[in-house]
Interface confidence: medium
Amino acid sequence: QRFAQAQQQLPLESLGWDVAELQLNHTGPQQDPRLYWQGGPALGRSFLHGPELDKGQLRIHRDGIYMVHIQVTLAICSSTTASRHHPTTLAVGICSPASRSISLLRLSFHQGCTIASQRLTPLARGDTLCTNLTGTLLPSRNTDETFFGVQWVRP
Amino acid sequence: QRFAQAQQQLPLESLGWDVAELQLNHTGPQQDPRLYWQGGPALGRSFLHGPELDKGQLRIHRDGIYMVHIQVTLAICSSTTASRHHPTTLAVGICSPASRSISLLRLSFHQGCTIASQRLTPLARGDTLCTNLTGTLLPSRNTDETFFGVQWVRP
Amino acid sequence: QRFAQAQQQLPLESLGWDVAELQLNHTGPQQDPRLYWQGGPALGRSFLHGPELDKGQLRIHRDGIYMVHIQVTLAICSSTTASRHHPTTLAVGICSPASRSISLLRLSFHQGCTIASQRLTPLARGDTLCTNLTGTLLPSRNTDETFFGVQWVRP
């Protein structure tokens, strides 16, 4: 009984349940391979509970191990388009602070038009995650085809 | 010490750990693109702890943010079989109540025989999730090739 | 307040937050299709909190439902290489104890060079997970291309 009451009185944030699910806003200007993300109930089913967006990139607010997941679908794409424009590659990594820069997850499209993956990784408060799409094909902005998210798992 | 005891006395359901992992039962009749799922220890490694099945479709019992994941493998499939010009597509969405109908996750097979993805999404008590497979290729019912599940992540 | 203090005093392990993320160490000798994994902060971003490695295979230390995820990328691979060497298949399963041996997750590469998937499955203390890669192509050891992990979700 006591436990249940205490749990209700504590803000969720103190339990470390940081989570975010983002939808694609736009791609970067020339020479900038980054995807720019957006999130919030007004936009549909995207949200940020803990992490924040910094100029379209996701910034972590709580140290811990996170499940990072992503799906990106190329727009106006067929298996022949995808192979003709190969290599189209997506990489998710920590892009700042520079001292912690590292690629966390990388996939190539080859003859497919969608990539989807997920992984567990330690992230620290202040880490900014960037998603780089290299190649000439553009991503779909449909919210059920392209999305990016993180979920805090444990300290 | 007190916390540990209290935690043991509380039913898991009160912690919001709703989770389900389903295996394919069958595909739908004519003009019904839905996959019909089944779950339970007697069937193997599938289970439902919280969510329920309603005529083969997964119904949510607790509001919250969920991780939804799916893998579907086409049976009797090779890269040439997986149609080039008419991709077979899988979509996961809320199909009822009608007022909340939306596509959550969508993938095409292109020249592959398996799709797998996952995403975070808010779901509400009573939401029913449908998985629509469009095309003429049939899915494998092998439990390690085709499965669908949800995991409650936070309120 | 009391809850927060009690929670801080309890070791994380008692909350059941077992988690591991591994990177590829090496492939097996001839006739052994298993991938051999490694993990630990000294190696980069891989880690084991609860589960252990037994000769490169992941052994579970806590009963419960786990999210198992994997990504494997083939080295020196293009869509033509992948299709020429088809079938290249990855299977994740319980390989010991023998009485619980079962395939949990299976994917073929077809014309792609990366597979990635995830699923929820019940695992028991002492279960050892093996990842079998069949075919002639070798996996990439890049830590952002090939990884394998588990996350305890609930009892």
Epitope: - | H26, H85, T134, R141 | -
Partner: antibody, heavy 118, light 109 residues
Framework: QVQLQESGPGLVKPSETLSLTCTVS??????????WSWIRQPPGKGLEWIGY???????NYNPSLKSRVTISVDTSKNQFSLKLSSVTAADTAVYYC??????????WGQGTLVTVSS | SYVLTQLTSVSVAPGQTARITCGGN??????VHWYQQKPGQAPVLVVY???DRPSGIPERFSGSNSGNTATLTISRVEAGDEADFYC????????????FGGGTKLTVL
Amino acid sequence: QVQLQESGPGLVKPSETLSLTCTVSGGSVSTDGYYWSWIRQPPGKGLEWIGYIYYSGSTNYNPSLKSRVTISVDTSKNQFSLKLSSVTAADTAVYYCARGIGLGFEYWGQGTLVTVSS
Amino acid sequence: SYVLTQLTSVSVAPGQTARITCGGNNIGSKSVHWYQQKPGQAPVLVVYDDSDRPSGIPERFSGSNSGNTATLTISRVEAGDEADFYCQVWDRSSDQDVVFGGGTKLTVL
């Protein structure tokens, strides 16, 4: 090599039920992914799809025949069967069983002629 | 339900190219399969998914599909090619999953 063989009476009286069996060798009727199908061809005419069964029980039928058709499977004998009730002379045809994968019917039986006549 | 329209007959001299068409509303959005049926025999799948050939089918058989017409092309026609040819579509979203065309009789002159 997969082979299909139709069997059953070649003559059926009007208003009775036509019953045919297809025996499969070189493959299993319980394998995922296959549409085990019946197709017919009236003398001198084109092909008409009757229906199919898959996943050891799920069936789909041609709407024009649906009220009279039943397709079933017997996995123990590796067979699937067709029953067509209330037959008339218009049901006289060569009846084929076939295996499809959603990209065409790649294996066919040799066909059996069923005549509806009193 | 969906209707596939084929010409009743097509004639071609040996060594020439035969083109057999199959018409249907927006057929280009569907997968089309072609069968060859010789007298007294069961049909044989010669082209599937618009343009793919099963193993054992000569390269002389090819297919295309766009708009409202799918076409089976047989180059360097031989006497042994004489047969009935049927197109077929398979669409689980319609009330009739499997639809065959009426068939085209190919005569080799």
